[in-house]
Structures are given as C-alpha cells and as structure tokens.
C-alpha cells in the first residue's frame, strides 16, 4: 500500500435544503483506470462510512444503496454532494480514494471537511 | 413488523473474542434494512455500537469500539453478526440487534429501529 496526498476544503457550510458541495483533489502518482472514493464521518463519538463509489476514469460515479452522495469526476478531481443533511449531521467528513487499478494499490485519506448544518426556522404563519 | 433473535453472547475472559449473530424475520427484503448493535450496561443507558448498511456493507463503529468488532452481515441468510476481539471488562453489557427500513445516512446511530431481546455478554478480568 502506497501513501497519496489527499486535498479538500476546510470547511463548508450546507444550504438551507440540507445539501452541501465539495472537492476531493488526490495527487495521482500513475494513470490510475479504477477509483473508489469514500466519504467518512467523524463526528459525536463515531466513524461512519456516509457513502461510497467506485469509477472508471472519465465516467459518472455511481453511488450504492439508495445514497445520499451524488458525484462526477474530471482528472484528479471528485466533486461530492451531500444532501438531505440535518443538524445533527454536522461534522467532519473525510474524504477517502483508493487507486484499485492497475497495481500498485494507492490510499489517501484527507484532512476532513467540517460541514455545518443549520435547520432551516419554520415559515412564521402569515396573513397575507 | 421485524422479529430479531440474537445469539452468542456468554462469558470470556478479558482479551478474548465472541461472535454475535441476529437472525431477522422481516417483511419485504432483508437487505432494505439498516441494520445495527446497540448495547446497555447495567445502570448506564443504551448506546451505539455498530451498524451496516443494507447492500454495499458501509459501516459505522463507536469509537470505543473501531478496531477491535467488526459488524457484517449475509443477505441470503437474513442475518447480521458482530465478531468482537479483544475485549474488555468495559465490554460487558446487553448485546441488542436493530433493524431500521430507511436508507444509509450520515447518522446511523438515530434510527427508528426495530429491537431484538438481546444477549448478554459478560467479560472478566
């Protein structure tokens, strides 16, 4: 197993709806054909594995188990979205690639993405 | 409506190992279930332990867990099971096996989980 840098923001702050966006950049060392991204959380005690997808270089990721990650790759460069996000989803949400194919195996775990999510107020009931 | 029945459980000395299994009786595809372990010691409340998600195998662990049980589960015999290595004495507690019919999420901890009876696992020092 052969060590990868990994980058990806600091923090981003999720919309209104419960989605939010970011960049997973790995430093490929070959011409990797096969990739497997996992998004994990750490967060209130626990490391969950959110969702997780495995590409062929220049096609669309494809997410299992009704996921809430959606993705498209370009290059080196995975962007992820996350949706139906609550509050109590906030955390830090490392991103994770694995070049599978062709040998020799790369890993790369990044820093981790701290993602606020604030519940929208209800609408106060209005007159008009 | 889901009945789960657990087994396994039993008395190990510290260090040692046990194999949890839940067997689930459900309704619909046993792999459309989330599936997990909680635990309760006496006096203490119930906590998470573990979880699977119900096709690709994502999992979610406790921190004071990771590294030492490990949850899996086989879809054709509608069953989940949680090897435990390397336990210890703060290990001994209720083993409960939950079932909840909901997709994966970030937050696999809060469910609205169907409860087995559980099995009791004691760890001596």
């Known amino acids: 197993c052969k060590a990868m840098h990994v980058a990806q923001p600091a923090v981003v702050l999720a919309s209104s709806r419960g989605i939010a966006s970011f960049v997973c950049e790995y430093a490929s060392p070959g011409k990797a054909t096969e990739v497997r991204v996992t998004v994990l959380r750490q967060a209130d005690s626990q490391v969950t594995e959110v969702c997780a997808a495995t590409y062929m270089m220049g096609n669309e990721l494809t997410f299992l188990d009704d996921s809430i990650c959606t993705g498209t790759s370009s290059g080196n460069q995975v962007n992820l979205t996350i949706q139906g996000l609550r509050a109590m989803d906030t955390g830090l949400y490392i991103c994770k690639v694995e070049l599978m194919y062709p040998p020799p195996y790369y890993l790369g775990i990044g820093n981790g993405t701290q993602i606020y999510v604030i519940d929208p107020e209800p609408c106060p009931d209005s007159d008009f | 409506e889901v009945q789960l029945v657990e087994s396994g459980g039993g008395l190990v000395q510290a260090g040692g190992s046990l194999r949890l299994s839940c067997v689930a009786s459900a309704e619909g595809s046993f792999s459309t279930y989330v599936m997990a372990w909680f635990r309760q010691a006496p006096g203490k409340e119930r906590e998470f332990a573990a979880a699977i998600s119900g096709r690709s195998g994502l999992t979610s662990y406790a921190d004071s867990v990771k590294g030492r049980f490990t949850i899996s589960r086989d879809n054709a015999k509608n069953t989940v099971y949680l090897q435990m290595n390397s336990l210890k004495p703060e290990d001994a507690a209720r083993y409960y096996c939950?079932?909840?019919?909901?997709?994966?999420?970030?937050?696999?901890?809060?469910?609205?989980?169907?409860w087995g009876q559980g099995t009791q696992v004691t760890v001596s020092s």
């Open positions: 939950a079932a909840d019919r909901r997709a994966w999420s970030a937050r696999p901890d809060m469910g609205n989980y169907y």
